[in-house]
C-alpha cells in the first residue's frame, strides 16, 4: 500500500507512518514502528503537558513567585500548568501574569467605574454633573450631591466633580 | 524568608505513635506538595509518602501503609505526618520537604528525631 | 516499584578532581532530582529535571541523562563538595531515592 501523506487526529506522520501521539500528561519516549506502537511516559511531579503531543520533554510548572506579587490561583497537574494569579490589591501586568502591579487609584473627580481583579486594572470614569469623588481611591464610585431640598435646606455653595454641594438655612425673608 | 520548621525531638516506646508537625512560613502551604522522608542513621534516604494540603490527597509507599497517615491543616500552614505501631527500625530522623518549582530551592525542615527503645 | 541504583556507593578523590556519580532506574523515568547531603543536616536540592541547577548551585555541578540512565557531575570538586549524594525519581509511586554515594576526602 501507498504510504499515507496524512494521519488522523491524534496522530502524527513519521517514517512514512502514522504514529500515535502522546496524550496530555505524557511525553514521547520512541516513536511507533511497523511492529510496535509509539512508546509514552508520563510527566513527573511539577511537570506537565497539555495537549496531545510528540514531546520528548514535559515542561515545568510556572512558579507564582510571591517576590513580584505573585500567588497560586490553581495548582498544575500532569496535564495543566500552575496558574498565577496577584495579591490583594494588585494586578497582573500580562495575560500570561509573570508579574504583578498595584492597582491604580482613581484621582478626586473621578470615581471607580469597574473594581480592579487579579487580572484587570481599575476602570475609572470622570464623575458627571451631579456626582463627586474628593478622595483618590481604588474602591470609591463617583457619590451624588447632596439633595438640599429633601432635607428642607438650600444649596449655599454649588458642587464639583471633586466637591459636593454645601447645603444651607432657607432664608426666612420673604418679599 | 521560606522555613519548614519542625517540631522537637520524640522518644517513644515499641507499638507507640508518634505525630510530627511541620510548620511552614513565606508561602502558602496549598501550593506545594508535602513530602516525608525517613533516614535510619547511618543509612540512605527513604520516601514515605506524600500530602496535597488543598485536598488532603494522600499517596504513601506501600511499606508504611496502614501505619502512617499524613495530614495538613491549612489555616495554620502546618503538616503532619502519624506513624504507629513503631518498632525499633524506626528509630529515625523524618524530614518534611515540599515539591519543587524552578527557581525555588525545594525546602526541606531541619528533620525530627524518633528514637524508638523500650 | 521503580528501584534506583546509585554507583559507585563511595568514592575517594581530591580537591579539583572530576567526580562522575551515575543512578540507574530498572524502568523509564521522565526526570531525577539530585540531592546533596553533609551529615546531621537535611538535604539540599543540587539539580531538578535531570539537568536544570537549583537556585544557588555552583556550575560545577551537572546532571544529564534519560529514560534510566542518568549522571551527576562535579567538574572540579571542591573542600565543600565532599557529602553524600542521592537521586531520587519523582515520575511513578512510589517516589525511590537511590542508595546514595559518600564522597570522600582521599
Known amino acids: 500500500p501507498e504510504p499515507p501523506t496524512a494521519c488522523r487526529e491524534k496522530q502524527y506522520l513519521i517514517n512514512s507512518q502514522c504514529c500515535s501521539l502522546c496524550q496530555p500528561g505524557q511525553k514521547l519516549v520512541s516513536d511507533c514502528t511497523e511492529f510496535t506502537e509509539t512508546e509514552c511516559l508520563p510527566c513527573g511531579e511539577s511537570e506537565f503537558l497539555d495537549t496531545w503531543n510528540r514531546e520528548t520533554h514535559c515542561h515545568q510548572h510556572k512558579y507564582c513567585d510571591p517576590n513580584l506579587g505573585l500567588r497560586v490561583q490553581q495548582k498544575g497537574t500532569s496535564e495543566t500548568d500552575t496558574i498565577c494569579t496577584c495579591e490583594e490589591g494588585w494586578h497582573c501586568t500580562s495575560e500570561a501574569c509573570e508579574s504583578c502591579v498595584l492597582h491604580r487609584s482613581c484621582s478626586p473627580g473621578f470615581g471607580v467605574k469597574q473594581i480592579a481583579t487579579g487580572v484587570s486594572d481599575t476602570i475609572c470614569e470622570p464623575c458627571p454633573v451631579g456626582f463627586f469623588s474628593n478622595v483618590s481611591s481604588a474602591f470609591e464610585k463617583c457619590h451624588p450631591w447632596t439633595s438640599c431640598e429633601t432635607k428642607d435646606l438650600v444649596v449655599q455653595q454649588a458642587g464639583t466633580n471633586k466637591t459636593d454641594v454645601v447645603c444651607g438655612p432657607q432664608d426666612r425673608l420673604r418679599a | 524568608e521560606v522555613q519548614l520548621v519542625q517540631s522537637g525531638a520524640e522518644v517513644k516506646k515499641p507499638g507507640a505513635t508518634v505525630k510530627i508537625s511541620c510548620k511552614v512560613s513565606?508561602?502558602?502551604?496549598?501550593?506545594?506538595?508535602i513530602h516525608w522522608v525517613k533516614q535510619r542513621p547511618g543509612k540512605g534516604l527513604e520516601w514515605m509518602g506524600r500530602i496535597d494540603p488543598e485536598d488532603g490527597d494522600t499517596k504513601y509507599d506501600p511499606k508504611f501503609q496502614g501505619r502512617v497517615t499524613m495530614t495538613a491543616d491549612t489555616s495554620t500552614d502546618t503538616a503532619y505526618m502519624e506513624l504507629s505501631s513503631l518498632r525499633s527500625e524506626d528509630t529515625a530522623v523524618y524530614y518534611c520537604?515540599?515539591?519543587?518549582?524552578?527557581?525555588?530551592?525545594?525546602?526541606w525542615g531541619q528533620g525530627t528525631t524518633v528514637t524508638v527503645s523500650s | 516499584d521503580i528501584q534506583m541504583t546509585q554507583s559507585p556507593s563511595s568514592l575517594s578523590a581530591s580537591v579539583g578532581d572530576r567526580v562522575t556519580i551515575t543512578c540507574s532506574a530498572t524502568?523509564?523515568?521522565?526526570?531525577i532530582l539530585w540531592f546533596q547531603q553533609k551529615p546531621g543536616k537535611a538535604p539540599k536540592l543540587l539539580i531538578y529535571?535531570?539537568?536544570n541547577l537549583a537556585s544557588g548551585v555552583p556550575a560545577r555541578f551537572s546532571g544529564s541523562g534519560s529514560g534510566t540512565d542518568f549522571t551527576l557531575t562535579i567538574s572540579s570538586l571542591q573542600p565543600e563538595d565532599f557529602a553524600t549524594y542521592y537521586c531520587q525519581q519523582r515520575t511513578f509511586y512510589p517516589y525511590t531515592f537511590g542508595g546514595g554515594t559518600k564522597v570522600e576526602i582521599k
Open positions: 520537604t515540599t515539591s519543587y518549582y524552578v527557581g525555588t530551592y525545594g525546602y
Open positions: 529535571s535531570t539537568s
Open positions: 513565606g508561602f502558602n502551604i496549598k501550593d506545594y506538595y
Open positions: 524502568s523509564s523515568v521522565s526526570y
